[in-house]
């Protein structure tokens, strides 16, 4: 058993039917010695008397808010949450596995640049009685500071019969140098509590591996005289790290017909312009990627050919 | 990424082309190592990230773009002195900091070259003959060093009398390749920045 925060305790349990459970001793936070009784949640049934209460915690019915009283007056509370260990693995019932880039990916994180600012998000099908708290650091043995905001509900979507809720959080490394070569990963830890169930999720990454630039901006077409060709030009996104000559991007230019089945023409370039043939009803799209470290491509910026 | 490779302009900062080749070569070698050593801890998540140049060179600091020198988090005051007569330098225009930067890069390359050659000698003794260092990568390191053209004492290749532990050697190869790829990215950024300056 360990303290999550004041008066909230997590009991770690080997979780299988008929498992022996854990013996827990609760102590009433009071100088009083006599006449103390204990109750659980809203029930008035007296579970025991005395300054301490010993309980065998085996299932969720044994968790909840234990209150010690004296003569009708509340003396203190202890909220017991359960953390399930199924066959030696901590349970992951609260969050959905996003399965990208691999199984057991519960937290996903992205950064728009090398400033040390990043966003993480996660999914759940649970809509009520749910709280999250997020901590982060650079490295774990001698952690360096990363400050995270509060997790907020950022999207809701319907998936088949289920509603899915997306939560996200923004974090900023306290003293980040965009040019630094990372040797210690960023660690992100999310505590999730649903009713009386506690779970924790972690993700470990280097900023360089979660980079996803914003799409190129100011995408423009300039028709070339007496030709079906056009000059496409664009700019680096505002959110990208500077100087651009040091933090360079590479680009992919795509000409896509109206039908998804039509052949796509693709050109790769390090410049911020390209000459392509603009077909009728087609659209031109450009996306960006770090030129030297192949992390994710940005989303496409698009403009119609007409 | 299989992209069309642009040939550098003749007037281009001469080391840029070599540094691009270096990054391509080390990335290919790392990919090959990951595939060949699939049952070894060779991914970025599995390995310890060690920098063999730590406390010996200060490439990131010495090569910091001017725009980032205002960022206090970037100013790790590690002072290292270097010899300064490189041929990549645009002669009189070169500041002392630029010379320091390029000579730091040269020292990095020299250190990695020694490590890779020592490691290759061990890998050649492996009866499994599972993986060897790409000669192209070693050649590209050499070409960039020659382009930088710094006079520096030659570091003798380390020789070991004891029987090599091939498992450990292969894990060390992965560690080294990951670190060298990160340094190659920095070198490429620096060359691109200097070329634009």
């Amino acid at each position: 058993i360990w303290e999550l925060k004041k008066d909230v305790y997590v009991v770690e349990l080997d979780w299988y039917p008929d498992a022996p459970g854990e013996m827990v001793v609760l102590t009433c936070d009071t100088p009083e010695e006599d006449g103390i009784t204990w109750t659980l949640d809203q029930s008035s049934e007296v579970l025991g008397s005395g300054k301490t209460l010993t309980i065998q915690v085996k299932e969720f019915g044994d968790a909840g808010q234990y209150t010690c009283h004296k003569g009708g007056e509340v003396l203190s509370h202890s909220l017991l949450l359960l953390h399930k260990k199924e066959d030696g693995i901590w349970s992951t019932d609260i969050l959905k596995d996003q399965k990208e880039p691999k199984n057991k990916t519960f937290l996903r994180c992205e950064a728009k640049n090398y400033s040390g600012r990043f966003t993480c998000w996660w999914l759940t099908t649970i809509s009520t009685d749910l709280t999250f708290s997020v901590k982060s650091s650079r490295g774990s043995s001698d952690p360096q500071g990363v400050t995270c905001g509060a997790a907020t509900l950022s999207a809701e979507r319907v998936r088949g019969d289920n509603k899915e809720y997306e939560y996200s959080v923004e974090c900023q490394e306290d003293s980040a140098c965009p040019a630094a070569e990372e040797s210690l990963p960023i660690e992100v830890m999310v505590d999730a509590v649903h009713k009386l169930k506690y779970e924790n999720y972690t993700s470990s990454f280097f900023i360089r591996d979660i980079i996803k630039p914003d799409p190129p901006k100011n995408l423009q077409l300039k028709p070339l005289k007496n030709s079906r060709q056009v000059e496409v030009s664009w700019e680096y996104p505002d959110t990208w790290s500077t100087p651009h000559s040091y933090f360079s991007l590479t680009f992919c230019v795509q000409v896509q017909g109206k039908s998804k089945r039509e052949k796509k023409d693709r050109v790769f370039t390090d410049k911020t312009s390209a000459t392509v043939i603009c077909r009728k009803n087609a659209s031109i799209s450009v996306r960006a990627q770090d030129r030297y470290y192949s992390s994710s491509w940005s989303e496409w910026a698009s403009v119609p050919c007409s | 990424r299989n992209l069309p490779v642009a040939t550098p302009d003749p007037g281009m900062f001469p080391c840029l082309h070599h540094s691009q080749n270096l990054l391509r070569a080390v990335s290919n070698m790392l990919q090959k190592a990951r595939q060949t050593l699939e049952f070894y801890p060779c991914t970025s998540e599995e390995i310890d990230h060690e920098d063999i140049t730590k406390d010996k060179t200060s490439t990131v600091e010495a090569c910091l773009p001017l725009e980032l020198t205002k960022n206090e988090s970037c100013l790790n005051s590690r002072e290292t002195s270097f010899i300064t007569n490189g041929s990549c330098l645009a002669s009189r225009k070169t500041s002392f900091m630029m010379a320091l930067c390029l000579s730091s890069i040269y020292e990095d390359l020299k250190m990695y070259q020694v490590e890779f050659k020592t490691m290759n000698a061990k890998l050649l003794m492996d009866p499994k003959r599972q993986i060897f260092l790409d000669q192209n990568m070693l050649a590209v390191i050499d070409e960039l060093m020659q382009a930088l053209n710094f006079n520096s004492e030659t570091v003798p290749q380390k020789s070991s009398l004891e029987e090599p532990d091939f498992y450990k050697t292969k894990i060390k190869l992965c560690i080294l390749l990951h670190a060298f790829r990160i340094r190659a990215v920095t070198i490429d950024r620096v060359m691109s920045y200097l070329n634009a300056s």
Epitope: W15, Y16, K84 | -
Partner: antibody, heavy 112, light 107 residues
Amino acid sequence: EVKLVESGGGLVQPGGSLRLSCAASGFTFSDYGMVWVRQAPGKGLEWVASISSGSSNIYYADTVKGRFTISRDDSKNTLYLQMNSLKTEDTAVYYCARNPYWGQGTTVTVSS
Amino acid sequence: DIVMTQSPSSLSASVGDRVTITCKASQNVGTNVAWYQQKPEKAPKSLIYSASHRYSGVPSRFSGSGSGTDFTLTISSLQPEDFATYYCQQYNSYPLTFGGGTKVEIK
């Protein structure tokens, strides 16, 4: 007493469908993840699918992905395995399990 | 997928013998390994989880050890009811995979 009882097995033609059920009792079913495991005649054990408490996370073996669907009804204390597009190689005894408890198994035979 | 290689595939032993079965994972699985016992025409029985933890009710003569890639199930003193097939399983990552089984027969 913890009990898991499978049902729904039988003989089916290739391409056909079957729905297996597993009735659970003696424990708070909704609080536990569950799995289906199968064993072809004379062969070893093969994991088929898993479902977490609350159905938030579901995983399948590649051999059944897209054809089989694991689900649960916590109000009925029942685990299901919907098997479509059955193949002869799906012939096996199917067990539902929640360690350390296993059902007795139900036999599925796919044959023309 | 993680391959669990069990050895031997079969062994002959006498009552009272110490029996050791090994299981090798093709990659690191931590301690996320379980062991099962199965008798002919019966459902498997869970013995060990987390490489070395016995489920309640499992006799103390069964013990598991190992971590990473190498795991062992030991029966300290073989009893008549222990003649069966034993399977290891990794549950570190999906797909969950079983070893091929070890049949323990009477000598």
